[in-house]
Structures are given as C-alpha cells and as structure tokens.
C-alpha cells in the first residue's frame, strides 16, 4: 500500500507499542536511481534492521522503560556504497503499556501527628514510583488506606490524598485522637496504577506507623489578678505554648478596649502591663494567637480569661448631699421614717462593700437627744422615743456615719415634722363620663384631666396626691401624671389602644397620699372616680410575627426546595396574601397563601450571603393595606469553587542562560468560605512530564514556590501547569498555568530586538 507502508526516502516518525512481538514490517523505502541499497544507523540497539532493498523492521519486542525514543538515520547508497540520498531522520516512538507495577519507596513509614492538628493538613507523605509513562494511566498512581488499626467505632481518623500520598487527619481524627487513650496507630496503604480505575491495575502496599503526640496548645486556666497592684509591671500572669519552636505569638482584643493592659512575648508568656481597676472593668476575655513565619495562624486562637479581684479601695458614698424625710406629728414609736441607702463601688456582697450605719449627731437635741435610731445594716430610720410636735421643733438634722471595713463617710439627713394626715383626698367629680377615641390615637396624648383636693398641710406628703388606675386597664395602656403644685391628674396614653381586644374600658381611679393616714381615718368613696373609654376601630395593616425572618440553607439545595416561610396576621381578621419584593437575583418564589418561600434557581453563597429580600403582607379585600418585613436567607457554604491564582502572573521571566537554578513565589485563592485559619491548599505539578524541569513546594496554606531543577532551558516561553487542591469536602482541584519566559537580558530586563515587542515579560526572577 503506497504511502502508508512504502514510499520514498524522507524524514518519518513511527509509533510502536512496547512489549509486542514483531508482526509486520515498519516501512518499505523505495530507491530512486542511482540509489540501489539502504543503510541504517543510530540507536538501533540491534533491534531495528533495514534490508538492502529498503525493508525497515524490528526483530524483537521494544521496551519503553529502556528507551522511549529511538533516533535512527536511513541513507540510500549507490552501487559503490556511496551515499546519494540522506541520511534522513527516522524516529521510533515507543508507546507505553502497563508492564510495570508501582512500588513504594519504603516498605515501612513512620510519622507522628499532634492531637487536634488541623484536618486535611499533611503530616506525612508516602511515595511510590512506577516506571510506566506518567502521562498515561499506566503510570498514574492512586493511593488508598486499606485499613486503620485500631479502628474505633468504625471511624476513620486518617485520610490520604489519593493523588499525592499526603496523609492527614480527618475531622473526627482532629477532634478525637488522644495520646492518653491510644498513642499509636498503624495504617496499611495501597497504591494502584491505572489511576486506580481498572481491574487490571498493578498494586503495592506499605505499612505506616503513626505516633500521636500531645497538643500543648491549650487554653490556660482562668487567671485572678488583684486590682491596684503596686508591684513593678509588667507582671507575668499565665502562658501559652505552641507545639514547636519558632511560633510568633500575639494577643487579640475582641472587645476593642480603649486601654488593653496585656501583652505577650515570643516565648508565649502573657503579662499584665499596668495596674487594673476592678471598678472600671472586673473581667477581661481576649485571645492568644500563634502564627508561622509568614503570618499565617497555626491553629485556632485560645481564649484567655482574667478576673480582677477586688480590694477595698472605695469609701461609701451618700445618695445625695442631704436626704430629706417627713414624719407626721402623731406617728408612733418604731414607725419607719425612711431608708438611707448609701453606695460602695467595691464588689457587691463582699466585706469590702458591706455597710454599717450609725447616728453620730442629732440637732437640735429637743426635747431630748436620741429621738431617732437607724438599723445598723439596713439604714432604716425609726422613731425611737416619743411622738414629735411640729410647733416645738419643725425640723431635725442627723449626721450619720456610714462605714465599710476600712473607710468612714458622713451623710446628712433632714427630717421635716409635718401635720398629721387626717384628711383624705376628695375627687371633684365621681364620674368623668364617656370618652371616645380612635385606636390609633398617639402614645403620649393627654385624654382627660382629673382633680382631687386634700385639706392637709400643703406641699407635704399628707396633702400630695398620687392617682392610680385600680380597675379597667389590666394591659397598662393608660397612666396618670400629677402636677405637684396643683395635684391635677393628666390621664395619658402609655401603650397603643386596641379596638380588637378592648373596645370599651370602665376605668376606676383612686387618689392616695404618699404619707399614711392617721389611725382611724380610711379612704372612702370620695377618693375614687370613674370614666368609660370607648375605642373605635381603625383599619390597620397586617402585622408580621417578626421584623426580620431568617432562614439558613446550604447553597447547593435543589431548585424547588422550601427555604423558609413568613407569617402575618390582620388585626381585623382579614385574610392575607403574601408577596416578595427585591428578589434582584431571581432566586425565590412565594406561595401567596401560606407564605412559604421556595428556591427557583441555583443559589450561590459567593454572590452574597445573607440574601435579603422584602416580604409584603396585604389584606385580601377590604382596603388592601399592606406591611413589609425582611426575609434574610443565610447561605451555608459548600466547596464549589476550585482554587485559582490570586492574581495575574503574566510577565514572569528568568534571564537566559540561567547561571543557577531560580525560583518564584505565587499565591492561590478560592471563593469558598474559609474559617479563622484561612485556606489550606496543596500544590503539585500539573503533569509528570514537567518533573524533569520544575518542582513546586508549599510555603503555607496559600503560597507555593516554583523552582527550576536545572539551568539548561531554551530561550523561549514555558507554560508550567500547576495543580492546586483545596482539601475540601469534596476536594476540588484547579489546574492553573504559569507562563515563564527565558530571555536574554539587558540590565536585568528582557531584551527583544525591534519588531519583537509584543508580550514582553515584565517581572524578572
């Protein structure tokens, strides 16, 4: 067949599977006179032969692992053996078959992991090699944990990255591993070629012994620190320790205090930097953080609690410069005159704030001294010896010593002797009639004025009138303010009126004095008055049961899922139709009868969470009044965004020729939610064929270093593919390309001759 199996002498490439016995010729070269014979040279390995007539064939099975490409030359000779055509290159590419099993580099691995280590953070790598072509499934390896010993409650504490062989803790392992219970584990790990996907794959196993070490990154016990310390500051109060040396410690003040009196040194020792004042702040809660050299948190922060212990550094204080009490002329012995309540800023219910009261002076001492006594601990003043007479002494002044265990303070009390309260308040009207108000009358409105009079001594507690509503207003919608000069009562609206619950209220007022009535005198019907409040209906808008409705769903819920519901009631009992407003992303629909809200499109947390829309409740029929509330849909993250490069990395270059291997740093990110510790990406080269020229090494959870393995690069652009895995559930992998140019440099910048100015790299490495 001319062309496919035979033809003239020209450069050609043939692909042949390894391991196959020769079954047909490779090619029949045709001689053009004066050529009469052919000659084969190059990497024949005594396998490839050309007969004089130009028949190229091989005489035994090829082995890709010995040589993946045979570079041959064929020349045509004349009758005298002189080359008249060629030699031309003939390339034989040996195609891979799966004829090599993967083998672990070690039959046993040993490693250690600290309890509570971050899930998904590798602490050990197992590594296997397979001589087959890594660009084909034959050389693509798949790692698996075969068994974990011991296995507690059927829970896996360890996981392996099936592509990289990185062993890390599962979430359960991070939470439950405890060296006190089980200090060591054994894993049997298998590796398969064919990406683990074929029944015909080869495999190998290895054993991994893991020691669990104690995590010393633990919150210390709460600290007690005495206030107003006179010791030299700073004073060490506690400490934290990261598991390994070299951590950088810092404190985080979550309360954002104007004065944060704590510090931490690079050993992890925590200090109070100045004296504390319990009366300013009695407790502090802050966080200790450990970071790596790149400023990335190594673990979760620890909560530090500091309680400030009280000392007696505050004297008692009087409630006011002078405290005034009244006592009636005829009051009996032992009657309470009033209570002096002093204060102490020291800690409540301790000896530092426990107060004693003592009368140290009475003026005037008429008709005698010691007319009053004060209860030592309660501060209640009582009449001690006899009834008082206003015409003899209308006013007494007492000096009272108030003391805690260390301090004494003098407080002053004025006691006014007043006329006996033998007259009751009398209403000028016993019935104030009917009053009709709309239910939407403003709060604070004065709706009625009432008046009673009292014949006792003016401007004393015996004649002052207090009005109380004693009947007809159990909801406390009304109140009465009294003018102290005229004793006029102003009835005001304190809470909204409501036709639906109280259309008619029969209100009863009582007028009373703050001072007790003398023995034998009682309040009677003259001290009571009534009125009738009639509330008229106003059509009110529906009322939502909440100002804001909140629901929480995973961002990957199926379309049509119920994501929440809202409820409203109409005060007049009309039915309600619900609607949505402001669904700018077109994600939701509402059942207008029930208020149930459903998804109608894929949700996306990364587009913004919570997603806020308005819900409207409208009366059906009637005047169609409506109310608005908020519906907030909190979207919980799922790992649905693969990692990507954090910025544009076009323009990376190395000066050619390289004098030494070079490297560059790049950063990855993704749009999913990352908790306090940030993302934890793993990095690897995107294809096996890059491994001869490049290597990638992780710096931290977001940064990696791409390094050259040698200096023999051509002067051109290389596109390096990098795999970035986010270790999420499920793990997502992004393959990104870093374009790196090797170019001649002038003064550290890429030099291009005129006319080759497009795409000049701008970043030198």
């Amino acid at each position: 067949q001319e062309g496919k199996f035979s033809g003239p002498l020209k450069p050609m490439t043939f692909s042949i599977y390894e391991g196959q016995e020769p079954s047909q010729i490779i090619f029949q070269f045709k001689a053009n006179p004066p050529a009469v014979t052919f000659e084969l040279t190059g990497e024949t390995d005594n396998i490839f032969v050309i007969e004089r007539e130009g028949l190229l064939y091989y005489n035994r099975a090829l082995d890709r692992e010995t040589r993946s490409t045979h570079n041959l030359q064929v020349a045509a000779l004349d009758a005298n053996g002189i080359i008249v055509e060629g030699p031309v290159p003939i390339t034989i590419k040996v195609k891979d078959i799966n004829d090599n099993r993967p083998t672990f580099l070690q039959s046993k691995y040993e490693g250690s992991v600290r309890q509570n280590s971050r899930p998904g953070k590798p602490f050990l790598y197992v590594n296997a090699t397979d001589l087959d072509d890594p660009a084909t499934p034959n050389g693509q390896l798949y790692y698996q944990i075969v068994i974990q010993l011991p296995m507690i409650n059927n829970v896996m504490y360890f996981q392996i990255n099936n592509k990289t062989g990185a062993i890390s803790l599962t979430r359960e392992g991070s939470q439950e591993l405890n060296p006190a219970k089980n200090p060591s584990y054994n894993l049997v790990i298998s590796v398969k070629d064919m990406g683990g996907q074929s029944e015909n794959s080869f495999s190998d196993t290895t054993s991994v012994d893991i020691i669990v070490t104690e995590n010393i990154w633990k919150a210390p016990k709460p600290v007690e620190m005495v206030e107003n310390s006179t010791d030299p500051h700073p004073i060490k109060i506690t400490q934290v320790r990261w598991n390994d040396p070299g951590a950088q410690y810092s404190l985080v003040d979550k309360e954002k205090l104007p004065r944060f009196p704590f510090s931490i040194d690079q050993e992890g020792d925590i200090y109070v930097t100045q004296p504390l004042d319990r009366e300013e702040k009695d407790a502090y809660v802050f966080y200790a953080v450990a970071k790596d050299e790149y400023g990335k948190p190594l673990s979760y922060p620890l909560e530090i609690h500091v309680k400030v212990k009280d000392i007696n550094d505050n004297p008692p204080t009087c409630p006011s410069p002078v405290t005034v009490f009244e006592v009636q002329e005829n009051e009996r012995l032992g009657n309470s005159i009033g209570t002096l309540t002093a204060h102490d800023r020291d800690e409540e219910n301790t000896a530092n704030s426990f107060l004693n009261y003592r009368i140290v002076e009475q003026t005037p001492k008429l008709p005698m001294d010691g007319l009053f006594l004060i209860q030592t601990y309660a501060g209640m003043l009582q009449l001690a010896k006899q009834s008082l007479k206003k015409q003899d002494t209308p006013q007494y002044n007492l000096t009272i010593e108030v003391s805690d265990k260390d301090f004494k303070t003098l407080c002053f009390v004025q006691i006014n002797v007043i006329d006996i309260n033998d007259q009751i308040p009398i209403f000028e009207k016993s019935d104030y009639g009917n009053l009709t108000l709309a239910e939407d009358t403003n709060i604070g409105s004065t709706i009625l004025t009432i008046q009673a009079t009292d014949a006792d001594e003016p401007f004393t507690g015996s004649s002052k009138i207090l009005y109380h509503i004693i009947k007809g207003d159990s909801e406390g919608r009304l109140g009465v303010d009294t003018d102290p000069h005229t004793n006029t009562g102003y009835v005001i609206i304190k809470k909204p009126l409501d036709f639906e619950t109280a259309a008619v209220s029969n209100i009863v007022f009582k007028a009373e004095n703050p001072e007790p009535l003398v023995f034998g005198v009682k309040y009677n019907a003259s001290s009571f008055a009534k009125f009738t409040l009639i509330v008229t209906d106003v059509n009110e808008a529906p009322q939502f049961s909440q100002h804001v409705f909140q629901a929480k769903v995973s961002e990957d819920v199926a379309i049509g899922t119920k994501v929440g519901n809202v409820t409203a009631k109409d005060p007049e009992g009309l039915d309600i139709s619900y609607s949505l407003r402001g669904d700018t992303r077109g994600w939701l629909k509402i059942d207008h009868v029930t208020g149930e809200i459903f998804s109608v499109a894929p949700l996306d947390r990364e587009a913004g969470s919570p997603y806020r829309v308005q819900v409207v409740a409208t009366e059906v029929g009637g005047s169609s009044l409506s109310s608005v509330s908020e519906f907030h849909l909190i979207l919980m993250d799922v790992n649905d965004n693969p990692p990507r490069l954090a910025k544009d990395y076009t323009g990376l270059f190395f000066c050619h020729p390289l004098s030494a291997p070079g490297s560059l740093i790049f950063e990855a990110t993704d749009d999913d939610q990352h908790l306090f510790r940030g993302p934890h990406f793993t990095f690897s080269l995107g294809s096996g064929s890059l491994q001869n020229d490049w290597e990638v090494s992780k710096i931290n959870g977001t940064h990696a270093r791409l390094s050259t393995r040698h200096t023999e690069f051509e002067e051109r652009e290389y596109v390096v593919l990098i795999r970035i895995n986010d270790g999420g559930r499920p793990p997502l992998e992004g393959i990104v390309s870093l374009p790196v140019t090797f170019c001649s440099c002038v003064e550290g910048s890429c030099f291009r001759p005129a006319g080759h100015q497009t795409g000049i790299p701008t970043v030198g490495m």
Epitope: D575, S577, Y578, S579, L580, R581, D583, L588, K589, I590, D591, H592, V593, T594, E596, F598, V600, V616, T618
Partner: nanobody, 121 residues
Framework: EVQLVESGGGLVQAGGSLRLACAAS????????MGWFRQAPGKEREIVAA????????IYTASVKGRFTISRDKSKNTLYLQMSSLKPEDTAVYYC??????????????WGQGTQVTVSS
C-alpha cells in the same frame, strides 16, 4: 404549560347556591397556587379566593368570606368554588387561574376562558 377549563356557571336567584369547577391539565405538578378571580361589567378583575395547591390552605376576599368555599381535588387536578347565599353584587365572569412561581398575587400565569355567574334579585 397548564391548561384550565371552567364549568358550572349560570343564572341563580339571590340567596341561592352554585358550584364552579376548573379542570387543570398539562404541567400540574408545577402549580404553586390556584385561585378564582371575577370581573363584573365596568370593574377591574379582583381575587375571590385562592388555595395553596399542596398544603390546601385558603384565603378569601372580605366580601365573600363565610359564603364561598374554595377547595381542590389533587387526584383529579380539579379546583372548586362552592358559592352560597349569593347576592346580586356577586354577578360577574368568574375565572380560574394558576401560578407556578413569581412574587405575588399578580403572577398568575395561566387562565381559563371564564364562566358567567348571574345572580338575580
């Protein structure tokens, strides 16, 4: 698509009763709400009653509450309106409607051709 066909209209004396029916076909599995609307000569179309197709909860306009009852038979894909104590002001063309999404009462996407109800005094 959802197709709707009403039946049961007619002439009735004030105080009498009528039962309207509405047969739904097509994508009935997508229905969220169904409702009865009416339009009297020279007036705007108004909602009479609506039902949550799956939950069966109902709402009524104030003027028919206590006199009309909306119901549905999911197995027959049929909506009903039982009208009692009819008044002359109930005279109108009654439409059956369905909605499968959207934000409010105005999002009824599918409509029947209407059936005339006349109440004489």
């Amino acid at each position: 698509e959802v197709q709707l066909v009403e039946s049961g209209g007619g002439l009735v004396q004030a105080g009498g009763s009528l039962r309207l029916a509405c047969a739904a076909s097509g994508r009935t599995d997508s229905i969220l709400n169904m409702g009865w609307f009416r339009q009297a000569p020279g007036k705007e179309r108004e909602i009479v009653a609506a039902i949550s197709w799956f939950r069966g909860e109902t709402i009524y306009t104030a003027s028919v509450k206590g006199r009309f009852t909306i119901s549905r038979d999911k197995s027959k894909n049929t909506l009903y309106l039982q009208m009692s104590s009819l008044k002359p002001e109930d005279t109108a063309v009654y439409y059956c409607a369905a909605r499968n999404g959207g934000y409010d009462l105005n999002d009824y996407a599918y409509w029947g051709q209407g059936t005339q109800v006349t109440v004489s005094s």
